[in-house]
C-alpha cells in the first residue's frame, strides 16, 4: 500500500495566551524534496484551511507573514504552532501532508486534533 | 457559490492543436489546485492533468505527457489546457474540477466537447 | 497506477429499492483517500462521497458508503427517481488520480 499516514495527538490543551502547538508526522512512501503542510479546522461538515505552508526538505518550514501559525520541520516531522487562539476556535484541527515533488504526488491526511481553548479569566480590579 | 466554466469546444483535426479554458468564480481562485478531467463518449472519467494553486508544480497523465500543456492565470481566475498533436482517441468531454481540501474533485465545470477527426 | 474495478456494470433496480454498489481496488487503499462521484446524462460529476464514508455538503443521507483496504461499497437505502444515474468510484490519494469505469443504476 503507497498511502501516506499521517500522524498527530488526538488532544491538545492551548496554554492561557493562546497558543496551542502538536507534532505531525508523516510516513513517507516516495523521496519528496517539496512538501506542502496546511492545518485544516473541521466544524459540522465545513472544513476550511487555516494556514499551510510548503518547504523544501532539510530547509525551515514557512509560513506567511500574516499566519497565525509558525513551524520548523525535521525530516518527516513538522512542529506547528498556531496562535491567537480563543475559545470560539475550540474544535478539530487536521493536519493535512502532500508531497509536491518530483512526481508521484502524494496527499496525507491526519485524524485530526481536538484543540481546547479556554479564555483566561480577567483579573479582577485590585485596590492596591 | 463556486461556479466552473470551460471554453474551447471544437472539431479539429488530428495532428492540430486546441486550447480549452476554465473560467472560475465564487471562490478564492488561487488557493486552490485545479484538474482536468476527460471522458470519451459512453466511457468513464480519466484524469489528465493537475495543476498547483501557485501553478508551479504540475502533473500530467501518461498517455497526454509530452502533448498537453496544463497553467493558469491566478489574475484572470482562469485555467487553461493547451492540447498539441491531437489524436483522435483524444476525443471526449473535458472537465475542469476543483481539487477539495481534503482531497476529492468538489465542484465541476459542465464540460466542453472536444471531436478529433479528419 | 491503482486500478479500480466497479461492480456489477449496471443494476436493474426499482424506486424503493436498495442498491449497493462495488468498488474494487488493486492494491491497498486508505478509506481517507476514496470518493463517489454521481453523473447524470449530459452532466458533470457530482462528489456524493469522500473519505469512503462522509457525505458531500447537501447529499441526503439514504446515500452512504463503507469499506477498506481493497473493498468499497456505495449504498442507497431507498432509491427515488433522481438517483438513477452513473456512479463513479476514485481514489485521491496519489497521482496519477484514478476512476472506476462506472456503475449505471438503472430502472427496472
Known amino acids: 500500500c503507497k498511502a501516506m499516514h499521517v500522524a498527530q495527538p488526538a488532544v491538545v490543551l492551548a496554554s492561557s495566551r493562546g497558543i496551542a502547538s502538536f507534532v505531525c508526522e508523516y510516513a513517507s512512501p516516495g523521496k519528496a524534496t517539496e512538501v506542502r503542510v496546511t492545518v485544516l479546522r473541521q466544524a459540522d461538515s465545513q472544513v476550511t484551511e487555516v494556514c499551510a505552508a510548503t518547504y523544501m526538505m532539510g530547509n525551515e518550514l514557512t509560513f506567511l507573514d500574516d499566519s497565525i501559525c509558525t513551524g520548523t520541520s525535521s525530516g518527516n516531522q513538522v512542529n506547528l504552532t498556531i496562535q491567537g487562539l480563543r475559545a470560539m476556535d475550540t474544535g478539530l484541527y487536521i493536519c493535512k501532508v502532500e508531497l509536491m515533488y518530483p512526481p508521484p504526488y502524494y496527499l496525507g491526511i491526519g485524524n485530526g486534533t481536538q484543540i481546547y481553548v479556554i479564555d483566561p479569566e480577567p483579573c479582577p480590579d485590585s485596590d492596591f | 457559490q463556486v461556479q466552473l466554466v470551460e471554453s474551447g469546444r471544437g472539431i479539429v483535426q488530428p495532428g492540430r492543436s486546441l486550447r480549452l479554458s476554465c473560467a472560475a468564480s465564487g471562490f478564492t481562485f488561487s488557493s486552490y489546485g485545479m484538474h482536468w478531467v476527460r471522458q470519451s463518449p459512453g466511457k468513464g472519467l480519466d484524469w489528465v492533468a493537475f495543476i498547483w494553486d501557485d501553478g508551479k508544480n504540475k502533473y500530467y497523465a501518461d498517455s497526454v505527457k509530452g502533448r498537453f500543456t496544463i497553467s493558469r492565470d491566478n489574475s484572470k481566475n482562469t485555467l487553461y489546457l493547451q492540447m498539441n498533436s491531437l489524436r483522435a482517441e483524444d476525443t471526449a468531454v473535458y472537465y475542469c474540477?476543483?481539487?477539495?481540501?481534503?482531497?476529492?474533485?468538489?465542484?465541476w465545470g459542465q464540460g466542453t466537447l472536444v471531436t478529433v477527426s479528419s | 497506477e491503482i486500478v479500480l474495478t466497479q461492480s456489477p456494470g449496471t443494476l436493474s433496480l426499482s424506486p424503493g429499492e436498495r442498491a449497493t454498489l462495488s468498488c474494487r481496488a488493486s492494491q491497498s487503499v486508505s478509506s481517507s483517500y476514496l470518493a463517489w462521484y454521481q453523473q447524470k446524462p449530459g452532466q458533470a460529476p457530482r462528489l456524493l462521497i469522500y473519505g469512503a464514508s462522509s457525505r458531500a455538503t447537501g447529499i441526503p443521507d439514504r446515500f452512504s458508503g463503507s469499506g477498506s483496504g481493497t473493498d468499497f461499497t456505495l449504498t442507497i437505502s431507498r432509491l427515488e427517481p433522481a438517483d438513477f444515474a452513473v456512479y463513479h468510484c476514485q481514489q485521491f490519494g496519489s497521482s496519477p488520480w484514478t476512476f472506476g469505469q462506472g456503475t449505471k443504476v438503472e430502472i427496472k
Open positions: 474540477a476543483r481539487k477539495g481540501q481534503l482531497g476529492p474533485f468538489d465542484s
